[in-house]
Interface confidence: medium
């Protein structure tokens, strides 16, 4: 390899540019270093002294080779709703993402801004696509022969049981009740539970209001913050 | 890898015109700044000429000013120096040459064409 | 004359170390241009041999090292072969003349 020996200041010639964390100080009019992560410049460089670096104070920060004047500030501290997937260090901001249960609705640049929970689709409903980091759970009302009979951000709907001789039918909200011994299931499609958003953190969990009566519709639910549709669980 | 082959050169009498042209090839031609540099007969190196990468900007040696003209032809990979009014002082190789992107120099050279004004 | 001055020759033995000087301006070197070496072999063009004041592009043997301080540079070869018999030449940008500079040459003979 070259041997690449630091010589800042330096003046770039007419075609050329400043090497990799280098910069161009429009005052100097000479190509200087640039402060490392954790630094910032404390002194700009003059044609003849190169810039001078100062270590971040507590809770700022710098990512990137910069020769900015001060470090940025970290970020407030998570909220409730949140957890610090990276704290914050000289080098790096703090992140903070949603809690197993809730995703992010409002995002920033590194993390989220603001969590909301996870929409939870009540009895007579099923999951039609799980919740992500950043997208809500969609509900679907549960189609003839399948049904759900819980309040859950996770389950879909399940295939009703097939009766030799039915006691009482299955609808969307309730399986079938057969009065032989010996039921079986149909084939229809079937893991139960759907994954949740991948995270370490325990489940924090939301008090669940009581399900109003399900409608026969048989179409897909709006996703977004708008009032809770129909099908789903109130925030 | 990086290839500069010069051309053009030869015999010219004096007052004379001549068009050098330099292929680039092995290198991302228009990222570049290019230069002419001469060399006369056991002589010195004396850099000519020089033009920014995408040709908008161009120098010139005292020696050479307003008698030559540098250019560049972006699509065609390819330097020119065209030379007017040339003098026997003119006699020399002309080597083209690139610019390194960083801290300067020229890092890449042709093996040059020879020009000799003679009458 | 050039802008730029060097020795017109030096010599050494083989396995010795030779430096060549070149001695600038405050409008080249005092500006804060870098400083450039080339060895051209007999017949051929010249090949980049120190950027930058002190670096070497790759393929360039370490036995090669530059040093610049103030107007002045410097060229130093150890271990010295005879296949470094050759002509040296120092560059660099001049702001007053807008343009770049060569020395005049340092000839190295290798006794």
């Known amino acids: 390899l070259p041997a690449q020996v630091a010589f800042t200041p330096y003046a770039p010639e007419p075609g050329s540019t400043c090497r990799l964390r280098e910069y161009y100080d429009q005052t100097a009019q000479m190509c200087c270093s640039k402060c490392s992560p954790g630094q910032h410049a404390k002194v700009f460089c003059t044609k003849t002294s190169d810039t001078v670096c100062d270590s971040c104070e507590d809770s700022t920060y710098t990512q990137l080779w910069n020769w900015v004047p001060e470090c940025l500030s970290c970020g407030s501290r998570c909220s409730s709703d949140q957890v610090e997937t990276q704290a914050c260090t000289r080098e790096q901001n703090r992140i903070c993402t949603c809690r197993p249960g809730w995703y992010c609705a409002l995002s920033k640049q590194e993390g989220c801004r603001l969590c909301a929970p996870l929409r939870k689709c009540r009895p007579g409903f099923g999951v039609a696509r799980p919740g992500t980091e950043t997208s809500d759970v969609v509900c679907k009302p549960c189609a003839p022969g399948t049904f759900s009979n819980t309040t859950s951000s996770t389950d879909i709907c399940r295939p009703h049981q097939i009766c030799n001789v039915v006691a009482i039918p299955g609808n969307a909200s309730m399986d079938a009740v057969c009065t032989s011994t010996s039921p079986t299931r149909s084939m229809a499609p079937g893991a139960v539970h759907l994954p949740q958003p991948v995270s370490t953190r325990s489940q924090h969990t939301q008090p669940t209001p009581e399900p109003s009566t399900a409608p026969s519709t048989s179409f897909l639910l709006p996703m977004g913050p708008s009032p809770p549709a129909e099908g789903s669980t109130g925030d | 890898q990086v290839q500069l082959l010069e051309s053009g050169g030869g015999l010219v009498q004096p007052g004379g015109s001549l068009r050098l042209s330099c292929a680039a090839s092995?290198?991302?031609?228009?990222?570049?700044?290019m230069t002419w540099v001469r060399q006369a007969p056991g002589k010195g190196l004396e850099w000519v000429s020089g033009?920014?990468?995408?040709?908008?900007?161009?120098f010139y040696a005292d020696s050479v000013k307003g008698r030559f003209t540098i250019s560049r032809d972006n699509s065609k990979n390819t330097l020119y120096l065209q030379m007017n009014s040339l003098r026997a002082e003119d006699t020399a190789v002309y080597y083209c040459?690139?610019?390194?992107?960083?801290?300067?120099?020229?890092?890449?050279w042709g093996q040059g064409t020879l020009v000799t004004v003679s009458s | 004359q050039s802008v730029l001055t060097q020795p017109p020759s030096v010599s050494g033995a083989p396995g010795q170390r030779v430096t060549i000087s070149c001695t600038g301006s405050?409008?080249?070197?005092?500006?804060?241009?870098?400083v450039h070496w080339y060895q051209q072999l007999p017949g051929t063009a010249p090949k980049l041999l120190i950027h930058?004041?002190?670096n070497r592009p790759s393929g360039v043997p370490d036995r090669f090292s530059g040093f610049k301080s103030g107007t002045s540079a410097s060229l130093a070869i150890t271990g010295l072969q005879a296949e470094d018999e050759a002509d040296y030449y120092c560059?660099?940008?001049?702001?007053?003349?807008?343009?770049?500079?060569f020395g005049g040459g340092t000839k190295l003979t290798v006794l």
């Open positions: 033009i920014s990468g995408g040709g908008a900007a161009t």
């Open positions: 560059q660099s940008y001049d702001s007053s003349l807008s343009g770049w500079v």
């Open positions: 092995g290198f991302s031609f228009t990222s570049y700044a």
């Open positions: 040459a690139r610019q390194s992107q960083y801290v300067g120099g020229f890092d890449y």
């Open positions: 930058g004041n002190t």
């Open positions: 405050s409008s080249n070197f005092g500006a804060g241009y870098g």
